[in-house]
Amino acid sequence: IWELKKDVYVVELDWYPDAPGEMVVLTCDTPEEDGITWTLDQSSEVLGSGKTLTIQVKEFGDAGQYTCHKGGEVLSHSLLLLHKKEDGIWSTDILKDQKEPKNKTFLRCEAKNYSGRFTCWWLTTISTDLTFSVKSSRGSSDPQGVTCGAATLSAERVRGDNKEYEYSVECQEDSACPAAEESLPIEVMVDAVHKLKYENYTSSFFIRDIIKPDPPKNLQLKPLKNSRQVEVSWEYPDTWSTPHSYFSLTFCVQVQGKSKREKKDRVFTDKTSATVICRKNASISVRAQDRYYSSSWSEWASVPCS
Amino acid sequence: RNLPVATPDPGMFPCLHHSQNLLRAVSNMLQKARQTLEFYPCTSEEIDHEDITKDKTSTVEACLPLELTKNESCLNSRETSFITNGSCLASRKTSFMMALCLSSIYEDLKMYQVEFKTMNAKLLMDPKRQIFLDQNMLAVIDELMQALNFNSETVPQKSSLEEPDFYKTKIKLCILLHAFRIRAVTIDRVMSYLNAS
């Protein structure tokens, strides 16, 4: 058993049928010695008396808010949460496996640049009685500071019969140099509590591996005289690291017909313009990627050909 | 993904082309190592990230763009005198380049070159003959060093009398390649910045 926060404790249970569970001793936080009784949650049934209460915690029915009283007055509370270990592996019931980029990916994180700021998000089908707490650091043995905000509900979607809820959090490394070569990964730890169930999820990454630039901005077409060709031009996104000559991007320009089945023409360039043939009803899209370290491509920025 | 090959203009900053080749070569070599050594811990998540140049060179600090010198987090041990030699500067005057930048890059290359050659000698003794260093990568390191044109003492190749542990050697190769790829990215950024200056 360990303390998650004041008066909230996590009991770790090896979770299998007929498991013996864990013996837990609760102590009433009071100078009083006599006349103390214990109850669980809203029940008025007295579970025991005395300054300490010994319970065998086996299932969720044994978890909850234990309260010690004296003469109708509440003295203190202890909330017991359960953390299930199923055949050596901590349970992951609360969050959905996003399966990208690989199985057992519960937290996904992205950064728009090398400033040390990043966003992580996760999915759940649970809508109520749910709380999250996020901590982060650079490295784990001698951790350096990363400050995270509060997790917030950022999107709701309907997936088949289920509603899916997306939560996200923004974090900022306290003293980040955009040009630094990372040798210690960022660690992100999310504590999740649903009713009386506690779970924790972690992700470890280098900022360089989670870079996803914003799409190029000011995408424009300039028709070339007496030609079906157009000059496409764009600019680096505002959120990208500067100077651009040091933090360079490379670009992919795509001409896509109205039908998804039509052949796509693609050009790769390090410049911020390209000449392409503009077909009728087609659209031109441009996306960006770090020129030297191949992390994710940005989303597409698009303009119609007409 | 293969990086686009830039054909440099004659007047172009001479090292940019070499640094692009270097990044391409080390990326290819790392990819090959990850595929060939699939049963070894060779992915970025599995290896220890060691920098053999730590405390010996200061490439990131010495080659910091001017725009980032205002960022205190980037100013750990920054030298302040300016570069004066090295043919890559190609007679351009630039306030960006600080005394250690190009010589620091040269020292990095020299250290990695020695490590890679020592390692290759060990790998050639492996009865499994599982993996060797790409000669192209070694040649590209050499070309960039020549283009940098710094006079520096030759570092003797390390020789080892004890029987090599091939498992450890292959893990060390992965660690070295990951670190060298990161340094090659920094070198490419620096050369790109200098080229634009």
């Epitope: 090896d14 299998y16 049928p17 498991a19 055949d87 199985n103 057992k104 | 049963f39």
Partner: antibody
Framework: QVQLVESGGGVVQPGRSLRLSCAAS????????MHWVRQAPGKGLEWVAF????????YYADSVKGRFTISRDNSKNTLYLQMNSLRAEDTAVYYC????????WGQGTMVTVSS | QSVLTQPPSVSGAPGQRVTISCSGS????????VKWYQQLPGTAPKLLIY???QRPSGVPDRFSGSKSGTSASLAITGLQAEDEADYYC????????????FGTGTKVTVLA
């Protein structure tokens, strides 16, 4: 004490369907994940499928994906395996088992797929 | 095919010590715990070892398990006639959990 009893096995022609049941007793069935494991005659153990305690997630072996469906009815304390498009290679003893460090197995039910 | 490899058979005289190996990789045994089962003819598997080296109550201390790196082993000391059975190791893969990975199985023969 924990008890698992499989039923529903038998002889079936290739391409036909069969539904296996596993009746659980002696524990809070709705709190635990459950597996189906099979063993072809004279062969080793092969995992077939898993369902979480609340039925929210289901996992299948590649060899049965798209043909078999695992389900549970927690109000009836019963685990099911719906087997469609059966093949000769599905012939095996099918066991249900609890998920956890200490597991409990049923006695098994024989499924024979033969023309 | 199983990704956990066991020898097809091992044998020993009564009273002897036999060991069964179970070889995997970094993503399965290297990252997860190992169980061992004993299966007597015509019966369901019985748990012998969990969490690599732990014995459930009722399992004789003649059975012991260990794990090192990407392989595990089961040792039976003081071999007895009733130990003649099939033995299976089981683990998980970090990317396909909760799918059970079973070993290929080992037939233990007690020599007369």
């Amino acid at each position: 004490q924990v008890q698992l009893v499989e039923s529903g096995g038998g002889v079936v022609q290739p391409g036909r369907s069969l539904r296996l049941s596993c009746a659980a007793s002696g524990f809070t069935f709705s709190s635990y994940g459950m597996h189906w494991v099979r063993q072809a005659p004279g062969k080793g153990l092969e995992w077939v499928a898993f369902i979480e305690y609340d039925g929210s997630n289901k996992y299948y072996a590649d060899s049965v994906k798209g043909r078999f469906t695992i389900s549970r009815d927690n109000s009836k304390n019963t685990l099911y395996l719906q087997m469609n498009s059966l093949r000769a290679e599905d012939t095996a003893v099918y066991y249900c088992k609890t998920h956890g460090s200490h597991d409990n197995w049923g006695q098994g039910t024989m499924v024979t797929v033969s023309s | 095919q199983s990704v956990l490899t066991q020898p097809p058979s091992v044998s020993g005289a009564p009273g002897q010590r036999v060991t069964i190996s179970c070889s995997g990789s970094r993503s399965n045994i290297g990252s997860n715990t190992v169980k061992w089962y004993q299966q007597l003819p015509g019966t369901a598997p019985k748990l012998l070892i969990y969490y690599n080296d732990q014995r459930p109550s009722g399992v004789p201390d003649r059975f012991s398990g260990s794990k090192s790196g990407t392989s595990a082993s089961l040792a039976i000391t003081g071999l007895q006639a009733e130990d003649e059975a099939d033995y299976y190791c089981q683990s998980y893969d970090r990317y396909t959990h909760p799918a059970l990975l079973f070993g290929t199985g080992t037939k233990v023969t007690v020599l007369a």
